[in-house]
Interface confidence: medium
């Protein structure tokens, strides 16, 4: 014979546990129904009556099947430097994240208390470690053979273009400038010779391995107090 389905509340068999979406009520000593997400226990079960559930009030939620006496409060409204990436509903908490280009500079369990703009690396410096939701950009000096001519929170140091003949050598904040190459027998007479790098690299190509004279990685550190262009923030 198939086992009878027990309806809550019921006394569990000795040594057995309550079923999914049920909980054991110590006072009633019965298996009772949990409340669904978006609800909470308004009245706990007894030996003869099951849990009475009620909907969460505005600005409160429960995310799981539960038997809590009151719903959880949604977190504070998002601040002006945050965006609400998940709204407060009866079944989920509000989630605030720092707006694009910003990161969380001070957080607690309740969420981010202060967003700050991502640091911008000045010319001569490139991004060594990109910013995340909770960490700032780390800048590093461009190693010999690489440069960055931007003030940016995303640009890395890029290799200098390689010239046949160098007009102006590159440095940490400027690319090399090539001269026009001398005509060779392989070129048609009268051809226009523009400055021509041997290879072209896209903006986002990783820099070539640094020469042995490059600073060690112990140099990778957040730039210290920096002028506004480098990402420090006022009020």
């Amino acid at each position: 014979l198939p086992a009878q389905v027990a309806f809550t509340p019921y006394a569990p068999e000795p040594g057995s546990t309550c079923r999914l979406r049920e909980y054991y009520d110590q006072t009633a000593q019965m298996c009772c129904s949990k409340c669904s997400p978006g609800q909470h226990a308004k009245v706990f079960c007894t030996k003869t009556s099951d849990t009475v559930c009620d909907s969460c009030e505005d600005s409160t939620y429960t995310q799981l099947w539960n038997w809590v006496p009151e719903c959880l409060s949604c977190g504070s409204r998002c601040s002006s430097d945050q965006v609400e990436t998940q709204a407060c509903t009866r079944e989920q908490n509000r989630i605030c994240t720092c707006r694009p280009g910003w990161y969380c500079a001070l957080s607690k369990q309740e969420g981010c208390r202060l967003c700050a703009p991502l640091r911008k690396c000045r010319p001569g410096f490139g991004v060594a470690r990109p910013g995340t939701e909770t960490s700032d950009v780390v800048c590093k000096p461009c190693a010999p053979g690489t440069f960055s001519n931007t003030t940016s929170s995303t640009d890395i140091c890029r290799p200098h273009q390689i010239c046949n003949v160098v007009a102006i050598p590159g440095n940490a904040s400027m690319d090399a400038v090539c001269t026009s190459t001398s005509p060779t027998r392989s070129m048609a007479p009268g051809a226009v010779h523009l400055p021509q790098p041997v290879s072209t690299r896209s903006q986002h190509t990783q820099p070539t391995p640094e020469p042995s004279t490059a600073p060690s990685t112990s140099f990778l550190l957040p730039m210290g107090p920096s002028p506004p262009a480098e990402g420090s923030t006022g009020d």
Partner: antibody
Framework: QVQLVQSGAEVKKPGASVKVSCKAS????????IDWVRQATGQGLEWIGE????????YYNEKFKGRVTMTRDKSISTAYMELSSLRSEDTAVYYC?????????????WGQGTLVTVSS | DIVMTQSPDSLAVSLGERATINCRAS??????????MHWYQQKPGQPPKLLIY???NLESGVPDRFSGSGSRTDFTLTISSLQAEDVAVYYC?????????FGQGTKVEIK
């Protein structure tokens, strides 16, 4: 306007406990922290800890851990600070203060203070 | 814990003159270009009152003769022209990390 109103003065014996209340009004109680700070007569300010009323999460100064309990009753917008195993050096004015979750990260509104005297 | 040390312990200034209070933290209270340092004023029998938050921001309703400056470990509260009602004890406080800590206070009096 934001207001924090604390319970009245207390006289306690050493070893006893005291529970100070702080009723908030003029803002959404569950949105911001309530901090507790004490000040012995003629002395400076000492931070005891804080509670986030929305979740009930607490952050205690290690110095008071094991002796302090911060709770809240959201239905009446009131925060409580209970200090147990009282000793004479706990005699002080106890203040509650609001600290906004965002922005200032400072205590911008304070209760009037509650004098707790510990004496045998 | 971050230790906050104020100087001087007390200060006597003539009415209309400038008063300067310093506060030094045992380690940096800066994070990402923000200084989590605040200044409070406390008059006898009253709770403290927030004057300056995050090093240099004037709290609403506070007279603009009060100003704050500094970063990392060294901070200053300046009263540009001392008034009789400014007689009080002034405290600095850091909220960069728990436990939040206060300076020992600086008593400002009229000379």
């Amino acid at each position: 306007q934001v207001q924090l109103v604390q319970s009245g003065a207390e006289v306690k014996k050493p070893g006893a406990s005291v529970k100070v209340s702080c009723k908030a009004s003029g803002y959404t109680f569950t949105d911001d922290y309530i901090d507790w700070v004490r000040q012995a007569t003629g002395q400076g300010l000492e931070w005891i800890g804080e509670i986030y009323p929305g979740s009930g999460n607490t952050y205690y100064n290690e110095k008071f851990k094991g002796r302090v309990t911060m709770t809240r009753d959201k239905s009446i917008s009131t925060a409580y600070m209970e200090l147990s195993s009282l000793r004479s050096e706990d005699t002080a004015v106890y203040y509650c203060a609001r600290s906004q979750v965002y922005g200032k990260i400072a205590m911008d509104h304070w209760g009037q203070g509650t004098l707790v005297t510990v004496s045998s | 814990d971050i230790v906050m040390t104020q100087s001087p312990d007390s200060l006597a200034v003539s009415l209309g003159e400038r008063a300067t209070i310093n506060c030094r933290a045992s380690e940096s209270v800066d994070n990402s270009g923000n200084s989590f340092m605040h200044w409070y004023q406390q008059k006898p029998g009253q709770p403290p009152k927030l004057l300056i938050y995050r090093a240099s921001n004037l709290e609403s309703g506070v007279p603009d003769r009060f100003s704050g400056s500094g970063s990392r470990t060294d901070f200053t509260l300046t009263i540009s022209s001392l008034q009789a009602e400014d007689v009080a004890v002034y405290y600095c406080q850091q909220s960069k990390e728990d436990p939040y800590t206060f300076g020992q206070g600086t008593k400002v009096e009229i000379k």
